[in-house]
Amino acid sequence: LEETLLNTKLETADLKWVTFPQVDGQWEELSGLDEEQHSVRTYEVCDVQRAPGQAHWLRTGWVPRRGAVHVYATLRFTMLECLSLPRAGRSCKETFTVFYYESDADTATALTPAWMENPYIKVDTVAAEHLTRKRPGAEATGKVNVKTLRLGPLSKAGFYLAFQDQGACMALLSLHLFYKKCAQLTVNLTRFPETVPRELVVPVAGSCVVDAVPAPGPSPSLYCREDGQWAEQPVTGCSCAPGFEAAEGNTKCRACAQGTFKPLSGEGSCQPCPANSHSNTIGSAVCQCRVGYFRARTDPRGAPCTTPPSAPRSVVSRLNGSSLHLEWSAPLESGGREDLTYALRCRECRPGGSCAPCGGDLTFDPGPRDLVEPWVVVRGLRPDFTYTFEVTALNGVSSLATGPVPFEPVNVTTDREVPPAVSDIRVTRSSPSSLSLAWAVPRAPSGAVLDYEVKYHEKGAEGPSSVRFLKTSENRAELRGLKRGASYLVQVRARSEAGYGPFGQEHHSQTQLDESEGWREQLA
């Protein structure tokens, strides 16, 4: 990018540059027309018969450098060929010299600084590539010369440019003074400011465009070259903030439209809101959940919104004495989540009718809550109690919902208490083929013992076909048809109106080897 400091083509008024010395044959200002018929100013000089050592100087007005360290001067000029000039002497030249002088203010006068090299700094002696030929009575013909010179380094507030003629017949058609700067550039969402290079290359720190944030790594920077070009180099740039996406060739961040979101900074575009969520404003980093829908704390910001599940279905209970097996079907609605668990709430009602939450004597296997399988075994039920179990399904957002948690209830009433296990079995008589047994009457909490069941089998014969049962209404029994000299394992259980109690411990007894021994009492 070029920034103009002076362009005589754009000057509509007299330039009125300073000439030295005040003699005939000096530089003179002329006006003409450019291609658009606009008035332009030029200077010409043609003192080809000048006195030896006589120079004609022309100095521009003071030009503020505006921070430029190097300034470029593009000269357009024509130069008359010395041979075309009939009165040209040996002093005729086809070159001129360019100088500059720096100052902090417009302090030059008609006589100062002294019109010579040092204090003026020589830039170059300019020779014409194209010479203009002029024949008497005919129009001059020849190309315009264009020369660009580089001034500097400059350090003061401004400068003057000066032209020294030592015998040329020439016209300075235009002067363009400019400096080069790197234009403002936006790349990778990073804005690099307009920069005037002060050296061969200058590092320039970038800043993120609006609604962008720095990417991890070093701060973005680019190099501005002396020629006003940005050095090509990968830029660790910026990325759009959450709720914004890159647009217009990675030069700006655009807010996500309504109904879309972008949860993280970085690359990527705005996405439609996930299920059961919405964004009513632009620039959303997260979509709000619909009423009744939630995100768990551990859910990503871009996750769909979910809802607690409905109640489990079809609870089936199987009561077995003091233990209960419950199982159920999964809820119809999972709420859109995979982290489904079940929990049970329990109330118990005594036979008299008073109810309360279940006591601590119940055990749940695998547990009363955080169940991942749809079943549980409850142990330690008390007889003749009514239990109400509420089975609820839960997921990761159940804790965020307000209002009652849906459940599936099941009522179970336990039987009255069965007699306790029968122990202390005694062998009252034994023979080679029979055993007479007796036991103490157990104390049945719910009514009298109605009868007993004796279960026995020969020791070593463990299969179900070898087990035999005998019922008796008395607290004694005779086992017949036994093997001579064999060992038998015996268990007894009692039955009341509440049902059978559990079998007692196995009792070990043995038949006689010989008849002649007779019956004899055996104590267990």
Epitope: A13, K16, E28, G32, T132, A171
Partner: antibody, heavy 126, light 108 residues
């Protein structure tokens, strides 16, 4: 001899037309930018119009724009001023004047008038 | 457009210095040229580019220009210098020229 000689002046009625001529001699006419300057009786000088060396650019004072036309015939070394819709206030001596010439580039001229004709009187009256 | 203002008349005794002013906004930034016109004659250029003298013009004629005022100075004024003097500069439009109202110099 370097000189400019105007002709074509005279008495003309308001609304009428007149064509002034200026014959140049003694210099390369086709390298010179030319102008017309007028002077009302007892008044000061007033620039009227200008034309560049090749004749393709013209410029006019606001007071005559649209009524006067400047032109030139370089083959005849002659400058013209065609005056139409003349008014009483156009009554003046009309001078043909040369702008200072470039050494060799007829695209440019100096801003002063370095050569004048003797003038021709135009009287607009009924 | 720029307006150039001159005093209608200036009087000077022979041999004295006559100064004729020409004023206008920021006139010092423009080149000013001066013309002499004697009765019944065409104008003659006496000073151009503020202070340059054409060949044939006596050295007693000089010019200056700064600020808002340009000045034509005739030192050692002679009777033959009695005439009307006009200043001229660029106008605002493209290649339009402006003249001052003129000053009648009387040599007493």
């Amino acid at each position: 001899q370097v000189q400019l000689v105007e002709s074509g002046g005279g008495l003309v009625q308001p609304g009428g037309s007149l064509r002034l001529s200026c014959a140049a001699s003694g210099f390369t006419f086709n390298n010179a930018w030319m102008s017309w300057v007028r002077q009302a009786p007892g008044k000061g000088l007033e620039w009227v119009s200008a034309i560049n060396a090749k004749g393709q650019f013209t410029s006019y004072a606001d007071s005559v724009k649209g009524r006067f036309t400047i032109s030139r015939d370089n083959s005849k070394n002659t400058l013209y001023l065609q005056m139409n819709s003349l008014r009483a206030e156009d009554t003046a001596v009309y001078y043909c004047a040369r702008k200072g010439m470039s050494f060799y580039n007829n695209k440019y001229a100096k801003s002063m008038f370095d050569l004048w004709g003797q003038g021709t009187l135009v009287t607009v009256s009924s | 457009d720029i307006e150039l203002t001159q005093p209608p008349s200036v009087s000077v005794a022979p041999g004295q210095t006559a100064r004729i002013s020409c004023s206008g906004d920021n006139l010092g930034k423009k080149y000013v040229h001066w013309y002499q016109q004697k009765p019944g004659q065409a104008p003659v250029l006496v000073i151009y580019y503020d202070s340059k003298r054409p060949s044939g013009i006596p050295e007693r004629f000089s010019g200056s220009n700064s600020g808002n005022t340009a000045t034509l100075t005739i030192s050692g004024t002679q009777a033959e210098d009695e005439a009307d003097y006009y200043c001229q500069a660029w106008g605002a439009g493209s290649h339009q020229m402006v003249f001052g109202g003129g000053t009648k110099l009387t040599v007493l």
